[in-house]
């Protein structure tokens, strides 16, 4: 070996100075008599080496690196050898920090593995090999006096937890526990825990199960779940409190917590849930009233709440067939009475013949919102119910009676916007209980089966805004019927558009006769079109060669017009504008020339 490096310390605080010396022996005869010693840290040459020849002929270079900012680097002592750098010796330098105090030390007792598992947070990176040791001792009191030491627990590399096996534990007796961290720059110790392993016991959760329905037990109410749990047997003798959490499977709802529940409850009816909804449930327990850790949440149990019978009001309306008055078409609409009114599976219309107690004849069972049935001759009334698996809604009686009530007056309709119509009326005297408003396409597309209807429960109402199934440029027939206690009034109807279309084109102008100063024009009116409002008037426009314009307004029934006061032998451009309340449109332009003064009139 020609050279040898010695350093003040191979491991230092990051950023601290370090001093190194390199001595080259005299017997390295192949070297220059006065070799220049160079220093290199990693790949970089380092200036500042102070070189001297010692009395024994050896060469020494000393360098001080003011700040070692590399966590690991090689320091080399070199000589120039021809064109290359020859390394004579090198040392590994390391820099870092002493270990921080480990914090958040906590332990839990696992009764299944019979071990105390402690974990901690090691603190910031030291950049140096750092060992952690979990140290503990047995103590009779509150850990002020140290009893038998327990064998150190050394975690596997990189782990921040360690298990003290049962043979080193004393249950129901305190233990002092702390973590010691050590590296080349120092040692640190966490604050000491003083604990009885049983006070940090973490139990296994019970297993949730659905309760087997017993024949004598009442089924759960709507929005309720019956469940039970099987405690973790090895923890059965430990007093515990438990809590249940649940949430609907669908949607973004967060967990709702129920508790505390005694472990021994073993079975439980959970209510106040949404009916007919699938729920996810979990349970966990903790030793209580003595200290302990919460168990993990149990595996999920998925259960569905029973549904509730529909809680709806059924608004009804009916029509008789004109050809067969005993054939009735009944319509209805469910109106929820509560926020959660229950699922509707279907509807049943039934009739109970008088004198036949209990005998109910179903007239129809449907999922639709209407049905047609033959009304038995003696039937004046039927009952309508909505049903699901949990039961039926309260029956709605439907009475078929003659129209004996007074009629409403001054029925009128007006457009609000292209998709709504306002229908208004003057209420009759006495006030009705309410009104049925029906609407659908007017002629020629009218159809009884395609009508929309609504019930207005307020008998004092003087109008109703129709917002459903209204489209522009369509003629609607609107029928309003007042409803009384046991009868109804005669129906009234009105026709209206929510938005009318301007005429699509004006009639073509034709020249019938022409003279020197006049011209007779005629046209064939456009046939009326559905969705287009009737014409209100025509305007005829004519312009001479000097670009002077003239016009005349004609009523909508006009079929022709004579232009007077024209100049002879002059050119005129004429067009007709057809107008309605919805707008106007122009015909094509007719160009004509009046006759010369010497010419004869043309008829």
């Amino acid at each position: 070996e020609c050279g040898h490096i010695s350093v003040s310390a191979p491991i230092v605080h990051l950023g601290d100075p370090i001093t190194a010396s390199c001595i080259i022996k005299q017997n390295c005869s192949h070297l220059d008599p006065e070799p220049q010693i160079l220093w290199r840290l990693g790949a970089e040459l380092q200036p500042g080496g102070r070189q001297q020849r010692l009395s024994d002929g050896t060469q020494e270079s000393i360098i001080t690196l003011p700040h070692l900012n590399h966590t690991q680097a090689f320091l080399s002592c070199c000589l120039n050898w021809g064109n290359s750098l020859q390394i004579l010796d090198q040392v590994e330098l390391r820099a870092g920090y002493p270990p921080a105090i480990p914090h958040n030390l906590s332990c839990l007792m696992n009764l299944t593995t019979s071990s105390l598992i402690c974990q901690w947070e090691p603190g910031p990176e030291t950049h140096l090999p750092t060992s952690f040791t979990l140290k503990s001792f047995k103590s009779r009191g509150n850990c002020q006096t140290q009893g038998d030491s327990i064998l150190d627990c050394v975690p596997k590399d990189g782990q921040s937890h360690c298990c003290i096996p049962r043979k080193h534990l004393l249950l129901y007796q305190n233990m002092g526990i702390w973590v010691q961290a050590e590296n080349a720059l120092g040692t640190s110790m966490s604050p000491q825990l003083c604990l009885d392993p049983m006070d940090v016991v973490k139990l296994e959760p019970p297993m949730l199960r659905t309760m087997d329905p017993s024949p004598e037990a009442a089924p759960p109410q709507a929005g309720c779940l019956q469940l039970c749990w099987e405690p973790w047997q090895p923890g059965l003798h430990i007093n515990q409190k438990c809590e249940l959490r649940h949430k609907p499977q669908r949607g973004e709802a967060s967990w709702a917590l129920v508790g505390p529940l005694p472990l021994e409850a073993l079975q439980y009816e959970l209510c106040g849930l949404l009916p007919a909804t699938a729920y996810t449930l979990q349970i966990r327990c903790i030793r209580w009233p003595l200290p302990g850790h919460w168990s993990d949440w149990s595996p999920s149990l998925e259960l569905r709440t029973t549904e509730r019978a529909p809680t709806v009001r059924l608004d009804t309306w009916w029509r008789q067939r004109q050809l067969d008055p005993r054939t009735v078409q009944l319509f209805w609409k469910p109106v929820p009475l509560e926020e959660d009114s229950g699922r509707i599976q279907g509807y049943v219309v039934s009739w109970r013949p008088s004198g036949q107690a209990g005998a109910i004849l179903p007239l129809c069972n449907t999922t639709e919102l209407s049905c047609t049935f033959h009304l038995p001759s003696e039937a004046q009334e039927v009952a309508l119910v909505a049903y699901n698996s949990a039961g039926t809604s309260r029956p709605t009686p439907v009475v078929f009676s003659e129209s004996r009530g007074p009629a409403l007056t001054r029925l009128h309709a007006m457009a609000r916007d292209p998709h709504s119509l306002w229908v208004g009326w003057e209420p009759p005297n006495p006030w009705p209980q309410g009104y049925v408003i029906e609407w659908g396409l007017g002629p020629p597309s009218a159809s009884n089966s395609n009508k929309t209807w609504r019930m207005e429960q307020n008998g004092r109402a003087t109008g109703f805004l129709l917002k459903e199934n209204i489209r522009p440029f369509q003629l609607y027939e609107i029928i309003v019927t007042p409803l009384y206690q046991d009868t109804m009034g005669p129906s009234q109807h009105v026709y209206a558009y929510s938005q009318e279309m301007a005429p699509s084109h004006a009639p073509e102008l034709h020249l019938k006769h022409i003279g020197k100063t006049w011209a007779q024009l005629e046209w064939v009116p456009e046939p009326p079109e559905l969705g287009k409002s009737p014409l209100t008037h025509y305007t005829i426009f004519w312009t001479n060669a000097q670009n002077q314009s003239f016009s005349a307004i004609l009523n909508a029934s006009s079929r022709g017009f004579v232009l007077h006061g024209l100049e002879p032998a002059s050119l005129y451009h004429i067009h007709l504008m057809a107008a309605s309340q919805a707008g106007a449109t122009n015909s094509t332009v007719l160009t004509l020339m009046t006759l010369t003064p010497e010419g004869s009139e043309l008829h």
């Epitope: 019979s114 003798h237 021994e264």
Partner: antibody
Amino acid sequence: EVQLLESGGGLVQPGGSLRLSCAASGFTFSLYWMGWVRQAPGKGLEWVSSISSSGGVTPYADSVKGRFTISRDNSKNTLYLQMNSLRAEDTAVYYCAKLGELGQYMFWGQGTLVTVSS
Amino acid sequence: DIQMTQSPSSLSASVGDRVTITCRASQGISSYLNWYQQKPGKAPKLLIYYASNLQNGVPSRFSGSGSGTDFTLTISSLQPEDFATYYCQQSFYYPFYFGGGTKVEIK
């Protein structure tokens, strides 16, 4: 000091009934599971039944299931064992015991002898 | 059900001897094993719970070990007052079973 005092033992004919009692003192009775263990003459120990601190959980040995009922009155610090349809093989010293959190019988009463014989 | 097999059923030993009694469970019971001592005409007394924990007031010559299915009670130096019958009991799952007992007699 924990004390458990059994009473109610005695001679009974097969098919008869007896009710054993165990008066507890020296600890918070309502916080602990309690149990009955029996020992037939010259034989080993046999677990009979246990009862949870509030009385909601009551496991039984198969040999007594349906005939014996364990109960407790936390207000009186007393444990009971109602024994019906007694058989000759139920003859034993019946011990009342306080259970620990890990299922160990921490303290035992002195026992009461039940003899089933015609 | 978890059955408990204790061996030997009896043994003779002298004062000062080291005595070992074993107990085997028919299936794993973690550390849920307890040891009791019973003297004639007396109620049993808890010695060791949870396999290796010495009950308060029990001399330290008694120790327990094992886990899973195989367990041992050791008396390091037998004393005159230790001649008795010893029982093991599992408390992992109901029904609880006791071992058949080991009678320790004076040689």
